[in-house]
């Protein structure tokens, strides 16, 4: 090289990346080798779970708010799904990107966009609960199917466009031993005056952005959508069981536990570029906590079906009638009543959850609380005695 | 061809100021990273000060810091090292040096001696 | 800081010799060192960065190695103009610290 060539500018930290070598100790190697058939298990159970999800809520099922939420989650985590085979084979082929830069860019734009689509899906999700219960009335007159696409298209183009920044500054990036990163690259498009500046801003800019538009404001959004239901319930004088309330949690957890470490490392490693000291750190666990972000699209179909006790037996009878007796809209399990009983019905069913599920084939866990999340009870479509009662009754 | 050529040292008494320039040549010089780096008459290397290639981010070790400062213009191609408070310690061959990527030194100039005495 | 030892601090060599110099950090330094080589009078010059990789221009009878705290430069057989003065420089955290040097002589 001339003493002139212009090396391809990097940041500080990813140039150290560049620096890391490969070890052949052995326990490494087995932990490599667990690590492939852990993922590859994952691709494979993420593209069935989302592809039976998708294919039974979208073709097998009566189309709902609800449902229309689901399928847009499940079409959401398909994509993830679809893209970890290829994390699989970059992790087989020992840590090295063998598919070139375009696809690199595609690649992790997809794991992206599934960050994004679902953290602004599950506010969606929460806000409509929340307004079923806070605004009955405006709720039954303007909770449409049409209307939740239109939303959903909203969120989905947002999503893109927030994903936008991570298309542009993924790149390829050779390793001193001979390996081919993925990563950021920030520096890829208009460096600016100074480098340093530039990547630290950057860095900075994309790990806070992604961690306040993906991670806390959905979060905020689902605990206080909560709050204000519950506040909305002890109003009226009603009382909501323990139980309940815990497992409404559990899907909170569920998704600031797959999601919340990854954020914790990606602003630690913006921090890392002010502090080298927390780089080894980052380098060890980001790894394991981006895995952990993409096993939540295998995960989510677990919570909305598979955690009933009496699954198998359920699946065996039918898996439409599992999916429906989770996915079934509030607002569609009144009886004949008039309109103004099936708004009060709503809010009475909510205020009593547990006299709705009542049945003996109740899904439990996540599955009941994804339920309260989709505005759903967990009731068949087919009603029981009680909850005929309940919806044709005026509070 | 890369030049780096210092000037600006001489003998100067103790807590006394100097101002050292390193001007460059033969290659874009706002791309790269500078650093001063300095040698002691019969010892080892030590590095003084580092600036980023636009100028925005410097430092130094705890041996100068407060005392030192670097700086650049990208307009005359100029490396700047300004030294106050000066101690004895100070006096070495001062040399500037061009930073490959984000470091590894790859072209030095050929030093300015810095004598600090009374 | 980061502490670097350098081993020998001078060595006697003869022209064709196998010649190892080792470098030590106080901690580990993850591969982000250089290594330089100084005549006397003269300016130093980058013989090997990133810990393995050959500076533009340098002989491939140098080579670099090592990992975590513990490097090494070869010289597989030593040449008349590679009597001088051998730096190792880490650059991990600042401070960067060099080693205190190893002089190469004439046996």
């Known amino acids: 090289m001339s003493a002139n060539a212009t090396l391809k500018p990097l940041c500080p930290i990813l140039e150290q990346m560049s620096r890391l070598q490969s070890h052949s100790n052995t326990s490494i190697r087995y932990i490599d080798h667990a690590a492939v058939l852990l993922h590859g298990l994952a691709s494979l159970l993420g593209l069935v779970e989302n592809g039976v999800i998708l294919f039974v809520v979208g073709c097998r099922m009566r189309q709902t708010v609800v449902t229309t939420w689901v399928l847009h989650l499940a079409l959401s985590d398909l994509l993830a799904s679809a893209s970890l085979p290829f994390f699989t084979y970059f992790l087989a082929v020992g840590h090295s990107w063998e598919l070139g830069t375009t696809f690199c860019k595609l690649h992790s734009s997809i794991f992206f966009l599934n960050m994004f689509a679902s953290g602004f899906l599950l506010s969606a999700i929460s806000l409509d609960r929340c307004l079923q219960v806070v605004r009955p009335v405006w709720a039954q007159n303007h909770r449409t199917v049409a209307a939740a696409h239109k939303v959903c298209l909203v969120l989905w183009a947002l999503a893109v466009l927030n994903t936008v920044p991570y298309f542009v500054f993924r790149d390829t990036i050779s390793r001193l031993d001979g390996r081919i990163m993925c990563y950021y690259n920030v520096l890829l498009l208009n460096p600016g005056p100074d480098r340093d500046a530039t990547c630290n801003s950057r860095q900075v800019a994309l790990a806070v952005s992604k961690f306040l538009l993906a991670f806390l404001v959905p979060l905020a959004i689902i605990a206080s959508s909560h709050a204000a239901v519950s506040l909305r319930l002890q109003h009226r004088g009603r009382r909501r069981p323990g139980r309940f309330v815990r497992l409404v949690a559990a899907v909170v957890a569920a998704f600031a536990l797959c999601w919340g470490p990854y954020h914790v490392f990606s602003l630690l490693e913006a921090r890392a570029h002010a502090n080298p000291g927390l780089r080894p750190l980052v380098w060890r666990g980001l790894p394991f906590v981006t895995s952990l972000a993409f096993f939540n699209s295998v995960a989510n179909p677990v919570l909305y079906v598979l955690t009933c006790p009496d699954m198998l037996r359920k699946l065996r009878r039918s898996l439409r009638t599992v999916l429906e007796s989770v996915l079934v809209d509030d607002s569609e399990l009144g009886g004949a009543g008039s309109s103004r009983r099936r708004r009060t019905s709503s809010t009475a069913r909510s205020a009593s959850p547990l006299a709705l599920c009542s049945r003996p084939e109740e899904p439990r866990g996540p599955a009941r609380l994804l339920g309260w999340l989709l505005g759903s009870c967990a009731a068949s479509p087919q009603t029981g005695p009680l909850n005929r009662a309940l919806s044709s009754t005026s509070s | 061809e890369v030049q780096l050529v210092e000037s600006g040292g001489g003998l100067v008494q103790p807590g006394g100021s100097l101002r050292l320039s390193c001007a460059a040549s033969g290659f874009t010089f706002s791309f790269y990273s500078m650093s001063w780096v300095r040698q002691a008459p019969g010892k080892g290397l030590e590095w003084v000060a580092r600036?980023?290639?636009?100028?925005?981010?410097?430092d130094y070790p705890g041996t100068v810091e407060g005392r030192f400062t670097i700086s650049r213009d990208n307009s005359k191609n100029t490396l700047y090292l300004q030294m106050n408070s000066l101690r004895a310690e100070d006096t070495a061959v001062y040399y500037c040096?061009?930073?490959?990527?984000?470091?590894?030194?790859?072209?030095w100039g050929q030093g300015t001696l810095v004598t600090v005495s009374s | 800081d980061i502490q670097m030892t350098q081993s020998p601090s001078s060595l006697s060599a003869s022209v064709g010799d196998r010649v190892t110099i080792t470098c030590r950090a106080s901690?580990?330094?993850?591969?982000?060192l250089a290594w330089y080589q100084q005549k006397p009078g003269k300016a130093p010059k980058l013989v090997v960065y990133a810990a393995t990789q050959l500076a533009d221009g340098v002989p491939s009878r140098f080579s670099g190695s090592g990992s975590g705290t513990d490097y090494t430069l070869t010289i597989s057989s030593l040449q008349p103009e590679d009597f001088a003065t051998y730096y190792c420089q880490h650059f991990w955290i600042t401070p960067w610290t060099f080693g205190q040097g190893t002089k190469v002589e004439i046996k």
């Open positions: 600036i980023s290639n636009g100028g925005s981010t410097t």
């Open positions: 040096a061009r930073h490959r990527t984000n470091w590894d030194f790859d072209y």
């Open positions: 901690e580990n330094i993850y591969w982000n």
